[in-house]
């Protein structure tokens, strides 16, 4: 059974969040996909979306967000560069499938951005200058404004009992901590 989970990324200002959302490629390869932020008690807000129909391996840049949809692999890559403290929050990928409600993808991302000197990014960070090598492109279609009320969510439980840390032998990098939290709807 698929579990809706949350993965926590702790990064410093100026660093890059680099994540992927997977989807059933047979069903959703060319569907328009979006990156949303979920604020407690509010409707998810769409920050960026792919073109409609979504183009294969074609980066779309909206401000500091870059989306890249690998159709033939069923993967949407999301990068948020030059992170700011205000970017902290809960994020999700969704697939637009009008007239049906948006289809939410696993997993949700809990991003925590803290102040801290990032200076010259370390070897395990992707510097914004490298990320911006992608030629900026804009979406041809605006992201749909409609988001189903059904995707309004409660914040997951804050109890540390529900937080499981990665296996102790995992050494991701010294800048990224990922914590998996079950989400109870």
């Amino acid at each position: 059974a698929t579990k809706l989970t949350e993965e926590k990324y702790e990064l410093k200002e100026g660093q890059t969040l680099d994540v992927k959302c997977d989807y059933t490629l047979e069903k959703f390869a060319s569907s328009q996909k979006a990156w949303q932020i979920i604020r407690d008690g509010e409707m998810p807000k769409t920050l960026a979306c792919t073109e409609r129909p979504s183009k294969n391996s074609h980066p779309v840049q909206v401000g500091r967000i870059i989306l890249e949809d690998y159709h033939d692999h069923g993967l949407l890559r999301v990068r948020m560069v030059n992170l700011q403290v205000e970017d902290s929050g809960l994020y999700q990928c969704v697939i637009y499938q009008p007239p049906k409600e948006p289809h939410m993808l696993f997993d949700r991302i809990r991003l925590v951005v803290t102040k801290g000197f990032s200076g010259t990014p370390g070897s395990n960070e992707n510097s914004t200058q490298n990320v911006y090598k992608i030629p900026p492109t804009t979406t041809k279609a605006l992201c749909p404004l409609y988001t189903s009320p059904r995707t309004v969510t409660q914040a997951p439980p804050k109890s540390t009992a529900d937080v499981s840390t990665p296996d102790s032998e995992i050494n991701l990098t010294n800048v990224t901590d990922i914590i998996r939290v079950p989400v109870f709807n």
């Epitope: 698929t2 579990k3 989970t5 993965e7 680099d18 994540v19 992927k20 959302c21 997977d22 989807y23 059933t24 490629l25 391996s57 890249e68 690998y70 033939d72 692999h73 069923g74 993967l75 890559r77 990068r79 696993f106 997993d107 991302i109 070897s123 395990n124 992707n126 510097s127 490298n130 990320v131 090598k133 499981s164 990665p166 296996d167 995992i170 050494n171 991701l172 990098t173 990224t176 990922i178 998996r180």
Partner: antibody, heavy 123, light 107 residues
């Protein structure tokens, strides 16, 4: 500790299919993608594709797309890779591999490898 | 697809030597590069990830550097147990590809 234990060697005839299993232990199976990498005798490494054991979604490189199926059984923490329409050039050692980071991270660093399964295709 | 070209394809060195292997990507891959060691009859082992980060348990004589298109893997003082084939691998985009490998032998 993390362990990936693969099924034993197989000998198959051209045109047949092979299903390789990969049993995971020492970590939460559904939290990390499983990838498959193959290596023909005396040759280099070739990435075949990935599977997210939580969602069950998978993807494979073009050359295998019509012939490979990646599945899992979460109840026994086991991933499977089935390759059909076998030909002699599919003779190789097939590895299942777990990535370094959780399934949402764009971090394709192959940290934990199974011991490999030799598949020989011969008439 | 991004092509990864390793050089040399084979290399013979003496114990205690400094050994350098290079990997060139066909386009800018930032620091999305890993290095693996494979001993005969064994599965590969991750040595360096993200171009320069040493994997846990890997001796400090191994190091990696570079970004963009040119990367280097160095063994500061070759030991007999380092005899293996070394591979680079990028993950800047899909599909992921490996270099063709560098076979390292003891003189």
């Amino acid at each position: 500790q993390v362990q990936l234990v693969q099924s034993g060697a197989e000998v198959k005839k051209p045109g047949a299919s092979v299903k390789v299993s990969c049993k995971a232990s020492g970590y939460t199976f559904t939290s990390y993608d499983i990838n498959w990498v193959r290596q023909a005798t005396g040759q280099g490494l070739e990435w075949m594709g990935w599977m997210n054991p939580n969602s069950g979604n998978s993807g494979s490189v073009k050359k295998f797309r019509d012939r490979v199926t990646m599945t899992r059984d979460t109840s026994i923490s086991t991933a499977y890779m089935e390759l059909s329409s076998l030909r002699s050039e599919d003779t190789a050692v097939y590895y299942c591999v777990r990535l370094i980071g959780y399934s949402s991270a764009w971090k394709w660093s192959f940290q934990h490898w199974g011991q490999g399964t030799l598949v020989t295709v011969s008439s | 697809d991004i092509q990864m070209t390793q050089s040399p394809s084979s290399l013979s060195a003496s114990v205690g030597d400094r050994v350098t292997i290079t990997c060139q990507a066909s386009r800018d891959i930032s620091k999305y590069l890993n290095w693996y060691q494979q001993k005969p009859g064994k599965a590969p082992k991750l040595q360096i990830y993200d171009a320069s980060n040493l994997e846990t348990g890997v001796p400090s004589r191994f190091s990696g550097s570079g970004s963009g298109t040119d990367f280097t893997f160095t063994i500061s003082s070759l030991q007999p147990e380092d005899i293996a084939t070394y591979y680079c691998q990028h993950y800047d985009n899909i599909p992921i590809t490996f270099g063709q490998g560098t076979r390292l032998e003891i003189k």
